[in-house]
């Protein structure tokens, strides 16, 4: 009979020592498992979960635009007085939802090529306003022209052609000239076959970004989604030195397995440049734990600031020796236009940027640039990059329309506003799949390991308690 | 084709007048603007006058600025040089030629003045 | 104004033979250089605009370079219609300016 009792208490310690064993072992088993299983569904390659969602983002992307209105036209171009602006928006079309195209695989060198086609669909019922809303806002052939031809003689013949069309230092254009392109009445007097259009962003539909070509992840995991080439060339030829590198991914997903401490590189052909970001702030995604990543105002810093920008600064007069920052001059990448890339608002710019600029009002929560990504798998589950578009305007003596300016402008157009975040259906998704396995092996292991030692613990106390009880 | 035919030269006498006329075809000289080049017997080329596009401004060489007056008929497609108190000096073959960027790619055959007593 | 230089005023030249011509400008005028050659009793033929870009029709053997204040005209292998005067030409600002001209002729 006691034999039996203590043979009871004996086997129930085993089998609570086996437990707790199998739940310790799980552990390391388990996350190599999950480590396997991940490796195995973020290669971009036929069949895994990451290649779905990357050849058509599962995601509703919005891009929004404030245009900025100028209210003193005149006082500006006569007497060269501060740029009074009232941003107007937001103006909301839907963006990325065509799947990349020309997607070749080269198992060589592990990479995956393509392009991604441009498009964008108004919704009105996310703007406060029609495509048709007209702003006044700075003429950009004639800001951009005296730029592109700083030859004096060529200058008074333009200036011929801006008077004959009656054009002027600022426009009256509707949102959709304004962002996809208008005939210019001044360029299409240029007797020669020239692009007379011009927009901010045209040409944009049916148009194409790329060809990028990207590790596949195949080979080495740590390199998935990394751009190993953009249009053919592992460099941009815009910028100087290590500037024109392209790094990291195109920030839709990164390597897996991100750490807190790692910095995030990504390169953006909206910004002409590779950037990176840094770790924020833990926060919950729709019951998702994910990571938010922030743009630092270290990367919008002068040379002076941030030695590691100096090849970022390419002109010495309008940055002050290099002394302004927050702008970007990115004119190399646009044909030569003075287009200048902002943070919203001039946000974390020198003062020296928007003291001639007044109803600007920058603010870091709505006009930083943030990704929210999801550590075990390195995918962006949400995003927003907001960057604005200035356009520089100098004094030309040859250009009437330009004469009276006192000094140069870098002026606000639009900033815009661009969005994703995962689906609440894609999400449940995410968690069943990805999240809520890892978190079920957590909880069994920890439920084995916990059973395991309390059942060890609690037959080992009762068969000593046992034998002494039996010894007396 | 682009054409630039040039006449209206001839003798004159110091401090005599006379007007150049520049027909062009192929294109319209409004949109374009014309100049007017000389060429003094064995000497190289010297730019004179210039009518920018679209009626804008005229231009003048130092030399001959405040005596000749650069013009342009639109409707006849036709380019002027009005020379008034000509001086020997100014005894040259006259081109006009068609810019829009500062280079010539079109001329016309030439003109000679000839000023003389 | 701007002052056009050219050298040398004259050259002698076998068919066949590379011809360099120079030319400096007083200041810089960037890429905005032209080259024209004349022949005698005719108007001048573009060769080159913007100091490298060869106008329509013009042949290969003609080419530019240059930018700044310095700039050259180089004929890679002279042929016989090649003998005349050449002349470069300032486009950066009014009044337009030339060279004075280099006269190639036969050896």
């Known amino acids: 009979m006691g034999c039996d009792r203590n043979c009871g208490l004996i086997a129930g310690a085993v089998i609570g020592a086996v437990l707790a064993v199998f739940g310790g072992i799980l552990m390391p088993v388990g996350d190599m498992l999950i480590e396997k299983t991940i490796k195995r569904e973020v290669v971009l390659e036929e069949g895994t979960t990451a290649f779905k969602n990357w050849v058509k983002t599962g995601t509703t992307v919005y891009r929004q635009f404030w245009i900025f209105d100028v209210q003193n036209p005149d006082d500006v171009a006569k007497n060269s007085s501060k740029i009074k602006v009232k941003q107007r928006g937001p103006y909301t079309y839907r963006v990325r939802y065509l799947a990349k195209e020309n997607i070749t695989q080269d198992p060589e060198d592990h990479t995956v090529s393509f392009v991604q086609p441009n498009g964008a669909i108004f919704e009105p019922s996310l703007s406060v306003g029609t495509e048709d809303d007209n702003f006044t806002v700075l003429n950009l052939a004639v800001a951009a022209a005296p730029h592109i031809y700083q030859n004096s003689f060529v200058q008074v013949v333009l200036n011929s052609l801006i008077k004959k069309s009656k054009s002027s230092m600022f426009q009256t254009r509707s949102l959709k000239e304004l962002l996809w392109g208008y005939k210019d009445p001044f360029l299409s007097l240029v007797p020669y076959p020239i692009s007379t259009t011009v927009g901010v962003f045209y040409p944009y539909n049916d148009t194409v970004d790329g060809v990028y070509k990207v590790f596949n992840g195949k080979d080495n995991i740590s390199k998935v989604a990394i751009i190993e080439s953009y249009k053919g060339k592992r460099n941009l030829s815009y910028w100087p030195s290590y500037c024109d590198m392209i790094n990291g991914t195109d920030a839709a997903s990164f390597p897996p397995f991100v750490e807190k401490s790692r910095t995030l590189r990504f390169f953006s052909s909206d910004i002409c440049r590779s950037i990176y970001a840094v770790f924020g702030s833990e926060i919950d995604l729709k019951g998702i734990p994910v990571y938010r990543f922030v743009l630092p105002a270290n990367a919008f810093a002068s040379p002076l600031q941030n030695p590691d920008n100096h090849c970022f600064c390419t002109e010495k007069v309008i940055s002050n020796n290099c002394t302004s920052y927050g702008v970007l001059d990115i004119g190399k990448c646009k044909e030569g236009k003075p287009v200048y890339i902002s943070l919203p608002h001039f946000l974390h710019a020198s003062p020296d940027v928007s003291e001639p600029i007044e109803g600007l009002h920058p603010n870091e929560d709505e006009h930083r640039t943030y990704l929210d990504v999801e550590p075990i798998t390195g995918f962006t589950l949400q995003f927003a990059k907001r960057l604005q578009v200035n356009i520089l305007v100098k004094p030309a003596r040859k250009i009437e329309a330009l004469k009276n300016l006192k000094r140069p402008y870098i002026v606000p157009i639009l900033w815009l506003n661009e969005t994703g975040t995962i689906g609440d259906e894609k999400a449940e998704m995410f968690k069943t799949q990805v999240t809520g396995k890892i978190k079920l092996l957590g909880m069994v292991e920890m439920a084995l390991l916990g059973i395991g030692v309390v059942m060890f613990v609690a037959f080992m106390i009762s068969y000593c308690a046992c034998k002494s009880k039996n010894g007396k | 084709e682009v054409q630039l035919v040039e006449s209206g030269g001839g003798l004159v006498q110091p401090g005599g007048s006379l007007r150049l006329s520049c027909a062009a075809s192929?294109?319209?000289?409004?949109?374009?603007?014309i100049h007017w080049v000389r060429q003094a017997p064995g000497k190289g080329l010297e730019w004179v006058a210039w009518?920018?596009?679209?009626?804008?401004?005229?231009y003048y060489a130092d030399s001959v600025k405040g005596r000749f007056t650069i013009s342009a008929d639109t409707s006849k497609n036709t380019a002027y040089l009005q020379m008034n108190s000509l001086r020997a000096e100014d005894t040259a073959v006259y081109y006009c030629?068609?810019?829009?960027?500062?280079?010539?790619?079109?001329w016309g055959q030439g003109t000679l003045v000839t000023v003389s007593s | 104004d701007i002052q056009m230089t050219q050298s040398p005023s004259s050259l002698s030249a076998s068919v066949g033979d590379r011809v360099t011509i120079t030319c400096r400008a007083s200041?810089?005028?960037?890429?905005?250089v032209a080259w024209y050659q004349q022949k005698p009793g005719k108007a001048p033929k573009l060769l080159i605009s913007?100091?490298?870009s060869l106008y329509s029709g013009v042949p290969s053997r003609f080419s530019g370079s240059g930018s700044g204040t310095d700039f050259t005209l180089t004929i890679s292998s002279l042929q016989p219609e090649d003998f005349a005067t050449y002349y470069c030409?300032?486009?950066?600002?009014?009044?337009?300016?030339f060279g004075q001209g280099t006269k190639v002729e036969i050896k």
């Open positions: 030409q300032q486009h950066s600002n009014a009044p337009l300016t």
């Open positions: 030629a068609r810019s829009f960027f500062g280079y010539f790619d079109y």
């Open positions: 200041q810089d005028v960037s890429n905005w």
């Open positions: 913007y100091a490298t």
């Open positions: 192929g294109f319209t000289i409004s949109s374009f603007g």
């Open positions: 009518i920018a596009p679209y009626g804008g401004d005229e």
